[in-house]
């Protein structure tokens, strides 16, 4: 038998060489297109296991899009035809709650999750006899990657997990299904940086295959929370990085989400974008914002993919995406997942399992309406899945998809066998569909979230709500004391109230100057390298938030450290959530906050508000009866008509949909 090369096994403390054999065909080679279903017998630790695999229909689309750039930097859009892909999910026969994510492209490669252990399998290099190596994921050497929590804390957490008998996976899964009965769909966009692309030999196909494999692994991990991962886009920075990746992880994350908001959202709708980087950040495996999955400005994360396997990397991306989905670190909380460590442990443990805490954190996000964008089943032209009637995703050529025949019995609008609408139905799903009919134009489908938001209405001829828009960044709010920024009025008092309760308000400026000049975890202007940055006096209002009149101590699923600083007859209150170095600190002043006359906070600096590019003269453009929205169109006040709020009418904008029902004048205001 061939012996594995040093490179292939140097990261393993133990492994076996096995030869899987296929049950469903006499010969090993599968003619293309790949089979929809296939079974293998594999050996692990002296036992034979029968594994049953089914192509992951929900993973990739008919119009799978890959963005790359040519030498001149021009964007190239490619639709590679990968309908009959080779990425599978499945289970191990006779092993309760087992799950598998495997590719069968060039041999078997992937992850097998059994009840008490996870295994990796990959083809043995240079073998001509279909030999593979199989190993426990626990036996993979991993660089100790930090998430801002000391090793002592991690050891203590691990020791505690070993002492206690964790509940079985069955119990956890049963509980989670009760907590999260409705399937959520994360429309994921992956961006691969230039260095990672170079590392893959500048082979776009290899990068694409690896990222599809990654998405399949993510799907296999998230399915236990009733969350499906749908890969809606891949961009490879083939010609050079489109953001500055110099600096700390926080700087790069900030640059990435700004780029995403400016360039990516407009090109391809998605819920979260994850940047895959080769460059490391001194042991930090990644970084992401918490609870921002549906945010236009912050739904993103960065993930370091250096000298590790894609199987190990999958748990890093699962972790950072978990942050976007509202999940905090498990450390210091009473969490269990049926394994020594869980995905949201801060130590980047390579775990495949989400903990009970992660399920609760995600449930909190959904209860607080932070996950509304996850309810839509991706549209046919957005979902990267090989079309398949019955996968609950509306693929190209389908009008609806109610799932299995049993599920379709409960759907009054959709014909399950054909994935077409029933003869009397106009629609089967969507915010503007009710009882198989389009809701009338003028039905409110997305209310305002703040004074800087505008409502959207059904248009009467579509099942979908109009796209979400808000008041243009830079519009004054809070009686000219603040500016609108990404649909929120950003001002200190409101931020203090979110953290310290409804009576809290901003501390005096002296507090900000005194505390933020220290450059420690309780007072700083961000992080540079391995240390906190002191705030210059002019930037002090953009560092750690300082509040007074505090009557409530915050609890956000994680207990923060609170500091009180006496200053000129008042107490300044600040907070450190200790979320770890891979999570931006919610105790900092929010971006877009007005820090002086005509100035706002950006990247912990107080800069000229002109960076917001607000260019709307509401008196001229909207005749004093409206505001400009984020598409730079007038949204008219009730009583005035779009597009320019010049004549009498019923409010709204060219983007909002009609604000009243044209067929029913009784509804007119």
């Amino acid at each position: 038998a061939a012996r594995p090369g040093f490179q292939q096994t140097s990261h393993l403390s133990s492994y076996e060489i096995i030869t899987p054999w296929r049950l469903t065909r006499e010969r090993r080679e599968a003619p293309r297109p790949y089979s929809k279903q296939v079974s293998y017998v594999i050996q692990a630790e002296g036992k034979e296991h029968i594994i049953h695999l089914e192509r992951n229909k929900d993973l990739l689309p008919e119009d799978f899009v890959v963005y790359t750039y040519n030498k001149e930097g021009t964007l190239i859009t490619d639709h590679p035809n990968i309908q009959n892909h080779c990425h599978y999910r499945g289970y191990v026969e006779g092993v309760h709650n087992s799950s598998i994510a495997l590719s069968d492209c060039f041999g078997l490669r992937g992850l097998l999750h059994l009840e008490n252990a996870s295994y990796g399998i990959e083809p043995l290099q240079n073998s001509s006899h279909f030999e593979h190596i199989i190993y426990r994921m626990d036996d993979v050497y991993k660089e100790p990657l930090k998430c801002g929590v000391s090793n002592k804390d991690i050891e203590k957490e691990t020791a505690k997990d070993e002492e206690e008998e964790p509940p079985s996976m069955t119990q956890l899964l049963r509980r989670r299904r009760a907590v999260l009965p409705q399937t959520r769909y994360v429309e994921l966009f992956i961006v691969v940086d230039k260095e990672r692309y170079d590392m893959m030999g500048r082979n776009q196909t290899a990068v694409r295959e690896e990222m599809i494999l990654l998405a399949n692994y993510l799907d296999s991990m998230y399915i236990m929370l009733n969350i499906r991962i749908v890969l809606v886009g891949l961009e490879i920075w083939t010609n050079g990085n489109l953001i500055n990746i110099v600096g700390g992880a926080g700087d790069v994350l900030g640059n990435f989400v700004q780029w995403r908001e400016k360039f990516l959202i407009t090109r391809r709708r998605h819920d979260s974008a994850q940047l895959v980087l080769k460059k490391g950040f001194g042991g930090t495996a990644g970084m992401a914002f918490v609870g921002t999955v549906c945010s236009r400005s912050h739904a993103g994360g960065i993930n370091v993919f250096g000298q590790i396997t894609v199987e190990t990397f999958a748990s890093i991306v699962a972790h950072e995406l978990g942050h976007n989905l509202g999940m905090n670190h498990d450390d210091g909380r009473d969490c269990s997942c049926g394994a020594k460590s869980c995905i949201m442990n801060s130590g980047a443990s390579g775990s495949r399992n989400f903990s009970s805490c992660s399920a609760e954190d995600f449930e909190k996000l959904t209860l607080n309406k932070g996950g509304n964008c996850l309810l839509n089943i991706p549209k046919p032209d957005e979902a990267y899945s090989a079309p398949s009637c019955g996968n609950k995703l509306v693929d190209a050529g389908e009008e609806c998809d109610c799932g299995t025949p049993k599920e379709c019995e409960l759907d009054p609008c959709c014909e399950g066998s054909t994935c077409k609408l029933k003869s009397f139905a106009e629609c089967a799903y969507g915010d503007c569909c009710k009882d198989c009919r389009f809701l009338p134009g003028g039905t409110l489908c997305r209310g305002k979230t703040s004074e800087c938001d505008v409502p959207e209405y059904c248009n009467g001829s579509s099942q979908f709500c109009q796209p979400d828009v808000f008041i243009q960044n830079g519009y004054p709010c809070q009686n000219n004391k603040a500016y609108c920024y990404n649909g929120m009025c950003q001002y200190y008092d409101a931020q203090c109230q979110v953290i310290f309760g409804s009576k809290a308000k901003a501390a005096p400026k002296d507090c900000f100057i005194e505390v933020n000049s220290k450059g420690d975890r309780f007072g700083n202007c961000g992080f540079s390298g391995n240390e906190y940055k002191k705030c210059a006096t002019g930037n002090a209002l953009c560092g750690k938030l300082q509040c007074e009149n505090v009557q409530e101590i915050p609890v956000f699923g994680i207990v923060p450290a609170i500091i009180q600083t006496p200053s000129r007859g008042t107490k300044c209150w600040g907070v450190d959530f200790q979320l770890g170095s891979d999570v931006p600190d919610p105790g900092m002043v929010n971006e877009g906050t007005k820090c002086g006359a005509g100035k706002i906070c950006r990247n912990f600096q107080c800069v000229d508000a002109s960076v917001l590019n607000y260019d709307c003269d509401v008196q001229k453009k909207c005749h004093g009866h409206g505001v400009c929205n984020s598409n730079k169109n007038c949204h008219c006040e009730n009583g005035w008509a779009p597009p320019n709020c010049e004549t009498k009418g019923y409010g709204g904008s060219v983007d909002s949909g009609p604000t009243y029902n044209e067929m029913n004048t009784a509804l007119r205001d």
Epitope: G447, K448, E637, N638
Partner: nanobody, 126 residues
């Protein structure tokens, strides 16, 4: 900028009546749909009634239909809530509210409204 001030609250016996007023200032008041909301101790704020800016349409929360009437006098920049057959469960702080963009039919579902009064207490008790 619109300012709203409520008045007319007080203590009343079950079955009794009260009339709340909401006086508005600001040039745009007469073009705003207006609503009444209430918040009982330990409960979320809830929609009660709304009236369109031309006073042609009104909307009510189910539990107050037939008992409460919303009206407005644009010449006086005032909105009223006439409450009859009051019940103990109507006890709450009553707020008058409005928004530049909200139509009356959507007032209860809008999620966030621009203008709020400070509230007036209504207590129904024997």
């Amino acid at each position: 900028e619109v300012q709203l001030v409520e008045s007319g609250g007080g203590l009343v016996q079950p079955g009794g009546s009260l009339r709340l007023s909401c006086a508005g200032s600001g040039r745009t008041f007469s073009r705003l749909a207006m609503g009444w909301f209430r918040q009982a101790p330990g409960k979320e704020r809830e929609f009660v009634a709304a009236i369109s800016w031309l006073a042609e349409t009104t909307y009510y929360e189910d539990s107050v239909k037939g008992r409460f009437t919303i009206s407005r006098d644009n010449a006086k920049n005032t909105v009223y809530l006439q409450m009859n057959s009051l019940k103990p469960e109507d006890t709450a702080v009553y707020y008058c509210a409005s928004d530049r963009f909200a139509t009356a039919q959507h007032m209860g579902a809008m999620g966030s409204l621009d203008y709020w009064g400070q509230g007036t207490q209504v207590t129904v008790s024997s």
